[in-house]
Interface confidence: low
């Protein structure tokens, strides 16, 4: 019988008392084969973290700073359940740390030196740790003691709880630096008042502070937020302009064998029986003998953290950067005006080989990071382990939902002004063998399908989105008799046609021979009835243009396109017979790397782009013998996006809506994780 006990860690006598009450009340409402609670008492949260890591306890609730400590080796804990605040309909699991300024003050985030600052309190998250952590490498050296460096950075501050004797500048705007509400500039509202009164130029608070202090929109409009990209935004645009997004209070568990499903089962049942307004005799979110015992008193319930989410992703790049800077106190030796090498994310072995060749040729401007799947690459870019990669539109959507931005677009047509003119897109098509003359768009049920990969534009999102509108369910593996859609569950009929060997079968990378455009077309040639690819795929792999044995004798005339009106047309008539227009592949990165990725990639394409005529003796960025490694092989140049610099603007309203509809069918664990951070 599996042990269904969750050992909860308590950090005080009062918490232990509440934990025992929790245990006893859960026993009274949960069947004997359900989850149960045991209580373990430790002296501190750090002791609890160590106990969970050592398998002496299973769970504890922590604030964000401690979630970071819990994640660090050797603890390796992960977030499993989040407390939420507000309503069940609009649950808030995060708050945003922001920098608020007056509208007419005219400076940006990178011009804070010499300004006057208002803080909620020394050592507090939104008011000190996050802003000072993010500014850390701009502080004058020596950076220790930190308070002295901060005092020398700003021209005057109010940082309640600071030592006014040793660091008088930190108390210049609020004499005495009192550490309670007796100091009018203490806490969130106090820091905002410090700005409002004109004592300071910037207030470091959380996003709700300004709304709590100014009910009138006209008053709020006198203030703006400083963004990390050195722009400003209105105060209600905090989701797109903040210093960090911070989880409020989170249950953590071991990453391996951590009982996360059991912990969720326990807490889900606990909130049903003892949540807000549920029971008189025991309340989960109430602390008669103290404050915030086990859980925050202000919490309204729990949400399960998606399993794909590790602590780094949960805490977010900005928060982790800020806390790491403060804890480790290390800054890069390079000055801020130098671009560090761009860490390119390469998928599997073949892309890594090409990337390494690029790295050597780039004289250290490009470094390579490997991952097994596109989603793993996106996650690495999010957390700073990698910086950039070029993505199909379907993954540009996921990357965008995860906070990344498009920076350059692949262009596929030769033009005089290639780099300045991003194209409208390419065509997603359905290809069949000419010999299968009875096959149309309307009778694909039961046929064998070939897809570039799950989640990609031409191979999945467009055809499956159209299909979903017809069949109104997500069971595509039942619609087709079998197929190859790399990235599907291994036991799915949509992995049956795939050709990868062993663990590589149906993997969404080049180890699966039927992956990507060329792979999906090969699948059609060798096994399938229909392939969902781009309009250039057939001509690129027929007429001897692809020398591989399976392709060298193929003839374009032996293939036709399926049109949505039920007719068929020759391959060259794609403009009048396609499923939809697809956005070109685009390079994505984090917002903070946007300028450098843009600059270095433009340098790189001048050196190794399509102006290189002999690819046998020279490195060519856009060539890989039809394997589309790192970039599509038909890329002519990487083009500026001009104002299409967000994923929504880049992909266009129509495509975003189409992918949004397909989200009900999404198997993307990363998309689930990212929409948890930003619904």
């Amino acid at each position: 019988v599996p042990d269904k006990t969750v050992r909860w860690c308590a950090v005080s006598e009062h918490e232990a008392t509440k934990c025992q009450s929790f245990r006893d009340h859960m026993k009274s409402v949960i069947p004997s084969d359900g989850p149960s609670v045991a209580c373990v008492k430790k002296a501190s949260y750090l002791d609890c973290i160590r106990a969970i890591a050592a398998n002496e306890a299973d769970a504890v609730t922590l604030d964000a700073g401690l979630v970071y400590d819990a994640y660090l080796a050797p603890n390796n804990l992960k977030p499993v359940v989040a407390e939420f605040y507000g309503s069940k309909e609009d649950p808030q699991t995060f708050y945003y740390a922001v920098a608020v300024v007056k509208k007419d003050s005219g400076f940006q985030m990178n011009q804070l030196r010499g300004k006057k600052s208002c803080h909620t309190g020394l050592g507090r998250s939104a008011g000190w740790n996050i802003p000072i952590g993010l500014l850390y490498c701009d502080l004058p050296e020596p950076r220790k003691p930190l308070e002295k460096a901060v005092a020398n950075f700003f021209s005057g501050s109010c940082a309640p709880c600071a030592d006014g004797t040793d660091f008088p500048q930190l108390c210049q705007l609020c004499p005495g630096c009192g550490c309670s509400t007796l100091n009018q500039y203490f806490g969130y509202s106090g820091a905002f008042k410090c700005l409002k009164d004109g004592a300071g130029d910037v207030a470091f608070v959380k996003h709700s502070t300004i709304f709590e202090n100014l009910a009138n929109k006209a008053d709020r409009d006198q203030y703006e937020l400083l963004c990390l990209d050195n722009t400003r935004k209105p105060v209600d645009e905090y989701k797109d302009c903040h210093l960090a997004q911070v989880p409020s209070h989170t249950v953590v568990a071991r990453s391996m064998g951590g009982k996360e499903d059991l912990i969720w089962e326990l807490l889900n049942q606990a909130q049903e029986h003892f949540g807000k307004d549920k029971s008189k005799e025991f309340q989960l979110f109430s602390s008669p003998h103290g404050k915030d015992l086990l859980f925050k008193d202000s919490a309204h319930g729990f949400l399960k953290v998606p399993p794909r989410m590790d602590a780094k992703m949960y805490l977010g790049y900005e928060y982790v950067t800020a806390i790491r800077n403060l804890r480790e106190g290390t800054c890069p030796e390079a000055p801020t005006d130098e671009c560090k090498p761009v860490k390119w994310c390469a998928l599997s072995h073949h892309e890594r080989l090409k990337c390494d060749e690029w790295s050597v040729n780039s004289v250290g401007k490009i470094e390579c990071v490997s991952a097994e799947t596109t989603e793993d690459c996106i996650a690495k870019i999010m957390n700073g382990e990698a910086d950039a990669m070029s993505l199909d539109g379907g993954f540009v959507y996921i990357a965008g939902k995860c906070g990344l931005v498009p920076v350059l677009a692949e262009n596929y047509n030769k033009s005089d002004n290639c780099e300045d003119t991003p194209e409208a897109g390419y065509f997603a098509i359905a290809v069949v063998k000419k010999s299968a003359s009875d096959l149309t768009w309307d009778n694909l049920k039961g046929k064998k399908s070939c897809h570039t990969a799950v989640g990609r534009t031409a191979g999945w999102n467009i055809p499956m989105g159209l299909l979903y509108n017809k069949i109104n369910h997500c069971r595509f593996d039942e619609f087709f008799s079998e197929g190859c859609a790399p990235g599907s569950k291994k036991d799915s009929s949509l992995c049956k046609l795939c050709m990868g060997s062993g663990l590589n079968l149906c993997e969404p990378n080049n180890k699966e021979g039927y992956y990507g455009y060329t792979g999906a077309f090969r699948c059609l040639v060798e096994k399938g009835d229909v392939a969902f690819v781009k309009h250039q795929t057939v001509p690129q792999n027929t007429g001897g243009k692809n020398p591989d044995p399976w392709a060298k004798n193929l003839n374009e005339k032996d293939y036709e396109l399926l049109c949505l009106d039920g007719t068929r047309k020759p391959v060259e008539e794609y403009a009048n017979c396609h499923l939809a227009r697809a956005p070109n592949h685009a390079v994505v990165t984090r917002k903070d790397k946007e300028a450098c990725v843009h600059k270095i990639l433009r340098q790189q394409q001048h050196l190794f782009g399509s102006n290189v005529t002999d690819c046998s003796g020279n490195f060519c960025l856009f060539r890989s013998e039809t394997k589309d490694l790192l970039f599509r092989d038909d890329t002519v140049c990487l083009a500026k996006l001009h104002d299409r610099n967000t994923y929504e603007k880049y992909l266009g309203e129509e495509y975003v809506k189409a992918v949004g509809n397909l989200r009900k069918c999404s198997t993307s664990s990363l998309l689930e994780a990212c929409t948890f951070r930003r619904p």
């Epitope: 030796e333 000055p335 801020t336 005006d337 130098e338 671009c339 250290g364 300028a595 600059k599 340098q603």
Partner: nanobody
Framework: EVQLVESGGGLVQPGGSLRLSCAAS????????MAWYRQAPGKGLEWVAG???????NYRDSVKGRFTISRDNSKNTMYLQMNSLRAEDTAVYYC???????????WGQGTLVTVSS
């Protein structure tokens, strides 16, 4: 303000040698990856060789084995030793920091190398 000054160009016969120097003022030199570029008459700019701050080097194929890039961080100077020169090496040679942010590249005024008999 960073300044880069190239010198050492001149007229040389095919098969001959030249040594170009690039002197950098300002702090950029000790931390940046440096590179030599060249521009032949009527042609576009092309990368010739690069050297990282730790001394790793790389060359375009057509100059490999003939040209050697080096740097002396204590003197804030980079060099390009060019041996077995050919007519097609005729160009204005520029040094650059190859890596500064937000498009503010630092370029010297160039030094002309003419290979002719």
């Amino acid at each position: 303000e960073v300044q880069l000054v190239e010198s050492g160009g001149g007229l040389v016969q095919p098969g001959g040698s030249l040594r170009l120097s690039c002197a950098a003022s300002g702090s950029i030199f000790s931390i940046a990856t440096m590179a030599w570029y060249r521009q032949a008459p009527g042609k576009g700019l092309e990368w010739v060789a690069g050297i990282t701050r730790s001394g790793s080097t790389n060359y375009r194929d057509s100059v490999k084995g003939r040209f050697t890039i080096s740097r002396d961080n204590s003197k804030n100077t980079m060099y390009l030793q060019m041996n077995s020169l050919r007519a097609e090496d005729t160009a204005v040679y520029y040094c650059t920091d190859y890596s500064s942010r937000y498009y503010h590249d630092y370029w010297g005024q160039g030094t002309l190398v003419t290979v002719s008999s």
